[in-house]
């Protein structure tokens, strides 16, 4: 249920140079009338290292048909996971099954969403009743950002599509959004 | 769960600017569709403008065009709202309000506690 | 720009059931007008009881329910009780623009 997926892209993102450690504070980002500029939220250079082409950060998509109870979407869906460990590209495709993860002495950056977007959706529901018009919130992006000891431990985990459909009348959980009803799934997914 | 904290209230002379500001915890505001509600005295709701994340851009509404800056600093997750060349009619308690995260977007899920902005001479 | 109209003033018994309605300039309010209803008390701020036509929060009381009616949104209320009296706002989606309704003053009785 939900996870249907017709397409499997990834996308690696290789940060821009930028300022160490943190974004510098982006002091009223204007976000004009009628303008997307960065999909209307400011862009992120998290972090600077002298061979750009070292770090990695991967935006998996994923085409599904999402639910809500037993109503399902009309049409699919395109969806991003973020994934990887921002760590040196050359170390992180395909190496999985030879053990060699790359793993920070230093700052642990994480490779997580980093703009989202919302998509109409029309749902259609069983035994006639009336469709639904509904609103995702999809990731649009993903950025390497760099977690320190404060970061929840909710945000160490990798981000799915949204990272979870919160449950019906069920409040979804600061930052990971709730309970990861389809987590095995997209797991299995990387 | 999204905690909005609005600023005090404001006595401003007309032709005056206000500045309103929100500060979101719970979540980051990049990632919630902040939008500006204001309430005059004994009078309905009026949506100013805010965040359309389809169009990934900011919407004012009509009558605040030209008039009306909302901006945001996202290293201190808060939005402003920013009123010129106000006039006795700008008098109102001004909301901010915002969704709730989640997969869903559920618009105006969560409001501060209103700013009360008067403006007289 | 739309005009989103509501009734003024309804009044309901205790127990007894009322039928608020929003209604667009534009014609027929559809689920692609994603309504939004609100409940403001006196001094307070405006909470949502509704959104997207029919979807309850975890706060909404049970006797509250969002529908589309003759060509309009719709909040139902079933089992009138005496704290429901307050302001309804309902809200309306025209893209990525947003109207209020002018409000409906409910009176339990």
């Known amino acids: 249920q939900g996870w249907q997926a017709f397409k499997n892209d990834a996308t690696e993102i290789i940060p821009e140079l930028g300022e160490y450690p943190e974004p510098p504070p982006e002091l009223e980002n204007n976000k004009t009338m009628n303008r997307a500029e960065n999909g209307g939220r400011p862009p992120h250079h998290p972090f600077e290292t002298k061979d750009v082409s070292e770090y990695s950060c991967r935006e998996l998509h994923f085409t599904r048909y999402v639910t809500d109870g037993q109503c399902r979407s009309a049409k699919p869906v395109t969806e991003l996971v973020c994934s990887g460990q921002c760590g040196p590209a050359r170390l992180l495709p395909n190496a999985i099954g030879r053990g060699k993860w790359w793993r920070p002495s230093g700052p642990d950056f994480r490779c997580i969403p980093d703009r989202y977007r919302a998509q109409r959706v029309q749902l259609l529901c069983p035994g006639g009743a009336a469709p639904r018009a509904r609103k995702v919130r999809l990731v649009a992006s993903c950025k390497c950002k760099r977690l320190t000891r404060f970061h929840n431990q909710s945000e160490l985990k990798d981000f799915g599509p949204e990272a979870a459909r919160p449950q019906k009348g069920r409040k979804p959980r600061p930052r990971a959004r709730g309970a990861k009803a389809n987590q095995a799934e997209l797991e299995n997914a990387y | 769960e999204v905690q909005l904290v609005q600023s005090g209230a404001e006595v401003k002379k007309p032709g005056a600017s206000v500045k309103v500001s929100c500060k979101v915890s719970?979540?980051?505001?990049?990632?919630?569709?902040m939008h500006w509600v204001r309430q005059a005295p004994g009078k309905g709701l009026e949506w100013m403008g805010g965040f359309d994340p389809e169009g990934g851009e900011t919407i004012y509404a009509q009558k605040f065009q030209g008039r009306v800056t909302m901006t945001e600093d996202t290293s201190t997750d808060t939005a402003y709202m920013e009123l010129s060349s106000l006039r006795s009619e700008d008098t109102a308690v001004y909301y901010c309000?915002?969704?709730?995260?989640?997969?869903?977007?559920?618009?105006?899920?969560?409001w501060g506690q209103g700013t009360l902005v008067t403006v007289s001479s | 720009q739309a005009v989103v109209t509501q009734e003024p003033s309804l009044t309901v018994s205790p127990g007894g059931t009322v039928t608020l309605t929003c209604g667009s300039s534009t014609g027929t309010v559809t689920i692609d007008h994603y309504p939004y209803w609100f409940q403001q008390k006196p001094g307070q701020a405006p909470r949502t009881l509704i959104s997207?036509?029919?979807d309850k929060h975890s706060w909404t009381p049970a006797r509250f329910s969002g529908s589309l009616l003759g060509g309009k949104a719709a909040l139902t209320l079933s089992g009138a009780q005496p704290e429901d009296e307050a302001e309804y706002y309902c809200l309306l989606f025209y893209g990525g623009t947003v109207v209020f309704g002018g409000g409906t003053k409910l009176t339990v009785l």
């Open positions: 997207d036509t029919d």
């Open positions: 719970g979540y980051t505001l990049s990632e919630l569709s």
């Open positions: 309000a915002t969704d709730a995260g989640g997969y869903w977007y559920k618009f105006f899920q969560h």
